[in-house]
Interface confidence: low
């Protein structure tokens, strides 16, 4: 639980934080676990301890191993372990999985890639960024503080991103690189011209005079969140609210459902105590979004009473 994996490349700076936290006033002792040898605190050493931080300036493959940190307070001691692995630099471009930090996901609206572990280092801007070993160029890429922003993210932007910066320690500069994968998710989905599932175009709905009747206008608009989509009913080309017949009401609120991943809306028209004159009206189901408007027309007809004569 109180063990942490850390890794780095030879001849680069690596700074590791003790997995056990304590107040700044607490002393922290570091040991090389295999030999139980104390890590010095003098900064003239290539590997030295500085409070909660263990610094390899620069790191060597031989530094690999488990390091013990003990946080000492007047009333307790807490022990943590840092499992450090230093790798040789790769001659080719590929960054092996064991050198990768956690994958981050981005979308059209949010495309920040944070440089991993950078907060442990004494660095100054600018940060350099590479994708699949190629330096990033162009106005779409903006190095901002400790992260990269990509404008107008596309699926092709997925890949391995490496940040490179300089750590300064007492006037000496050390290079640091860190790589993580970036995946692109389609957050907005898509929208399409409205598709009315019900009612069918020019449908005739049978109703009984004196009874209640419901008509449902149901349409689908695309996949994912639809910012602008509506279904509504009109009577003889007039909005229900303007038509002025209190017996005929639209159900308040539209139900958003997802049919096969599609975003769909329903609007129910309720007709109370159906009258003869209702059969003369034209009922229009309208579905509207960014692409335009689709209309399906329904008419009512009297349901013939069942003949009970033998």
């Amino acid at each position: 639980k109180f063990s942490k994996q850390s890794w780095g490349l030879e001849n680069e700076a690596l700074i590791v934080r003790c997995p056990r936290q304590g107040k700044p006033s607490y002393t922290v002792d570091w040991y090389y676990s295999q030999t139980n040898k104390s890590i010095p605190t003098q900064e003239r050493n290539r590997v030295f301890a500085s409070g909660q931080l263990l610094k390899f300036l620069p790191a060597a493959v031989a530094d690999s191993g488990i390091y013990t940190c003990i946080v000492r307070s007047p009333t307790f001691n807490r022990t943590g372990y840092a499992n450090v692995t230093i790798y040789k630099k790769q001659s080719d471009c590929n960054v092996p999985d064991y050198l990768m930090y956690s994958t981050v996901s981005g979308s059209e609206k949010n495309s920040k890639i944070y440089c991993p572990t950078i907060d442990l280092y004494n660095w100054t801007a600018p940060l350099e960024w590479f994708k699949n070993c190629q330096a990033l160029q162009g106005s779409r890429y903006r190095a901002h503080k400790s992260f990269l922003v990509i404008d107008n993210v596309m699926t092709e932007d997925a890949g391995d991103y490496t940040c490179k910066f300089i750590h300064n320690e007492n006037g000496a500069n050390y290079s640091v690189t860190a790589t993580r994968s970036f995946t692109v998710k389609d957050e907005q989905g898509f929208s399409l011209f409205p598709v009315i599932g019900a009612p069918a175009q020019n449908e005739i709905k049978e109703v009984e005079i004196g009874k209640n009747a419901n008509l449902t206008c149901s349409a689908c608009f695309g996949k994912g969140t639809q910012f602008l989509a509506a279904v509504l009913w009109q009577l003889n080309g007039t909005k229900i609210t303007d038509f002025g017949e209190p017996r005929i009401q639209q159900e308040e609120g539209q139900n958003q459902s997802f049919s096969n991943g599609l975003a769909c809306l329903d609007m129910v028209l309720r007709i109370a105590d159906v009258k003869e004159e209702d059969l003369l009206l034209q009922y229009d189901c309208l579905a509207l979004n960014l692409h335009g408007l689709r209309r399906h027309t329904v008419r009512l007809s009297r349901k013939n009473p069942i003949d009970h004569h033998s």
């Epitope: 059209e108 609206k109 969140t225 910012f227 602008l228 989509a229 509506a230």
Partner: nanobody, 117 residues
Framework: EVQLVESGGGLVQPGGSLRLSCAAS????????MGWFRQAPGKEREFVAV????????YYADSVKGRFTISADNSKNTAYLQMNSLKPEDTAVYYC??????????WGQGTLVTVSS
Amino acid sequence: EVQLVESGGGLVQPGGSLRLSCAASGFTLGDYVMGWFRQAPGKEREFVAVIYTSDGSTYYADSVKGRFTISADNSKNTAYLQMNSLKPEDTAVYYCVVSFSTRGPYWGQGTLVTVSS
């Protein structure tokens, strides 16, 4: 309750310009879109332009692309439609609309634009 007030409509000659404004009130800020539809006499309501206030991205109907520009002032909850090189076929009632990811759309009362010599 969300309220939209459109202004800026009027009579203009072909080739002229107009700027429509739509002031929205009655909601707290979040991700939303503001846009314009229009309805010419005897025709269906049609999409004109929309702006996503979260990132400023804009979308236009092909018939107005290059002539109309939509913009928004988030601090005032106001959308604008700058209409240049107006044609007689742009004559219509222009409706402002605002819509949220979870509710809406809400429509304005409309402002009449007439393009005629």
